[in-house]
Interface confidence: low
């Protein structure tokens, strides 16, 4: 055998070496990688030294048989079937209160015929649930609400008024209250006609004002 | 383990309209954030997305094939549906439905179908 | 339409060389702090595959030899050390409006 070499590299089971034929002079770098589904065990890099011996014991290839930590997701506690995560483990995520689950809430460590085992799905997100809008309520009989959205986000006010001759009984306006879900603060107010007096004190103030004939005021009353 | 599979006619004459089946397992529509969508794929060319349906029943469409398109779901038994309108030869192509993740951005498409190839021929 | 032009159409690089593959958008598919960018690996006959998400995000289950980068209108697919079996064809798409499309394609092959 060469003195002014390193000693042979052999090939490793379940991996390959590269260069697959490397000089064995001084400086040389060999890099071992294992096939899919194993990992390097020791160092991957070898280098040949000064002394002509390599830097390192020649490493192995050993089978994966865990997942990797799919990790912590924020605003989430995790429960684990298992430490290590080998596989048939499961990781299941509940988001905490005032967030949603974005994803799949549990995951499953399966084995691949090919490759490293896999988690069956990525890990989720826990979202800010968004506030849900209030729907919107119906304008009460006799009087209007505005503005007139089918929903209103949380936050929102709306007001309500009544026709001439009705009265509002209840609130004028309420208001879209944040929460899960939101809601009003009050219920809706209604228009209740104003007393027969004040009704008929009212229509004549309009007549004594409408000039004569008036279709508008046919239409009115 | 999630996996999606598709299914359609293989033949079909100019004109008709194309149907097409996606049934999937390892996940539910009616998870938030869960979208499956239709990309195509003529034989040696690229991909075209064509449509997709968030777990929302929002749907949305490859403006150039709107007024053809049609995507559906049938959430209790795990399939999602597109049509396409007054098919063509050039309608010929592989069609994959795939799945994706909406978390606060639309992600790629993770998971796909093996395909199905759809021929239109006179 | 959002167009997303890839280069080059086609690549040679050696056994354990670098691949390094472009895409290019019309207009920029960044926004809030997010580069709506995927890269994906198609073989002949199979489904494409998700190798890359939101421009540098490695998708689980691929090898680290695969990174992206990029934002706004210019994006990079790199391979390193590229290996024999990532001879085939390369795509990026963009998720940043509809349509969503994607670009032409690049094939790679090993010299």
């Known amino acids: 055998p060469r003195n002014d070499t390193c000693p042979e590299l052999p090939e490793i089971p379940n991996g390959w070496k590269s260069p697959s034929q490397p000089e064995l002079v001084h400086g040389t770098v060999v890099t071992y990688q294992c096939y899919p589904g194993y990992q390097v065990v020791g160092s991957s890099v070898l280098m040949c030294q000064w002394d002509l011996t390599w830097s390192e014991d020649l490493p192995s290839c050993q089978r994966v048989t865990s997942c990797h930590d799919p990790g912590d997701v924020e605003h989430s506690r995790r429960l684990i079937s298992s430490p290590k995560f080998p596989v048939g483990a499961t990781v299941q995520y509940i988001c905490d209160q005032g967030f949603v689950l974005m994803g799949s809430s549990i995951l499953t460590c399966h084995d691949r015929q090919a490759g490293s085992p896999k988690w069956s799905d990525r890990a989720p997100k826990c979202l800010l649930e968004q506030l849900k809008p209030c729907h919107g309520l119906s304008a009460p009989e006799n009087g209007a609400r505005s503005p007139e959205k089918q929903l209103h986000p949380a936050g929102a006010t709306i007001h309500f008024s009544c026709a001439p001759g009705y009265v509002l009984k209840g609130q004028a306006s309420i208001k879209c209250v944040p929460g899960h879900p939101s809601h009003w603060s009050d219920p809706p107010p209604i228009c209740r006609a104003a007393s027969l007096d004040g009704f008929y004190n009212s229509r004549s103030l309009d007549v004594a004002k409408a000039p004569a004939a008036s279709s508008t005021l046919d239409a009115a009353h | 383990q999630v996996t999606l599979k598709e299914s359609g006619p293989g033949i079909l004459q100019p004109s008709q309209t194309l149907s097409l089946t996606c049934s999937f397992s390892g996940f539910s529509l009616i998870t938030y954030g869960i979208g499956v969508g239709w990309i195509r794929q003529p034989s040696g060319k690229g991909l075209e997305w064509l449509a997709h349906?968030?777990?929302?029943?929002?749907?949305y469409y490859n403006t150039a094939l709107k007024s053809r398109l049609t995507i559906s779901k049938d959430t209790s038994n795990n399939q999602v549906f597109l049509k396409i309108a007054n098919v063509d030869t050039a309608d010929t192509a592989t069609y994959y439905c795939?799945?994706?993740?909406?978390?606060?951005?639309?992600?790629?498409?993770?998971?796909w179908g093996q395909g199905t190839l759809v021929t239109v021929s006179a | 339409d959002l167009v997303l032009t890839q280069s080059p159409a086609s690549l040679a690089v050696s056994l354990g060389q670098r691949a390094t593959i472009s895409c290019r958008a019309s207009?920029?598919?960044?926004?809030?702090?997010?580069?709506?960018m995927h890269w994906y690996q198609q073989k002949p006959g199979q489904p494409p595959k998700l190798l890359i998400y939101l421009a540098s995000n490695l998708e689980s289950g691929v090898p680290a030899r695969f990174s992206g980068s990029g934002s706004g209108t210019d994006f990079t697919l790199n391979i390193h050390p590229v290996e024999e079996e990532d001879a085939t064809t390369y795509y990026c798409?963009?998720?940043?409006?509809?349509?969503?499309?994607f670009g032409g394609g690049t094939k790679l092959e090993i010299k």
């Open positions: 207009e920029s598919v960044s926004t809030s702090g997010y580069s709506y």
């Open positions: 798409q963009h998720s940043r409006e509809l349509p969503y499309t």
């Open positions: 795939a799945r994706m993740v909406y978390y606060d951005y639309d992600g790629g498409f993770a998971y």
């Open positions: 349906i968030w777990w929302n029943d929002n749907k």
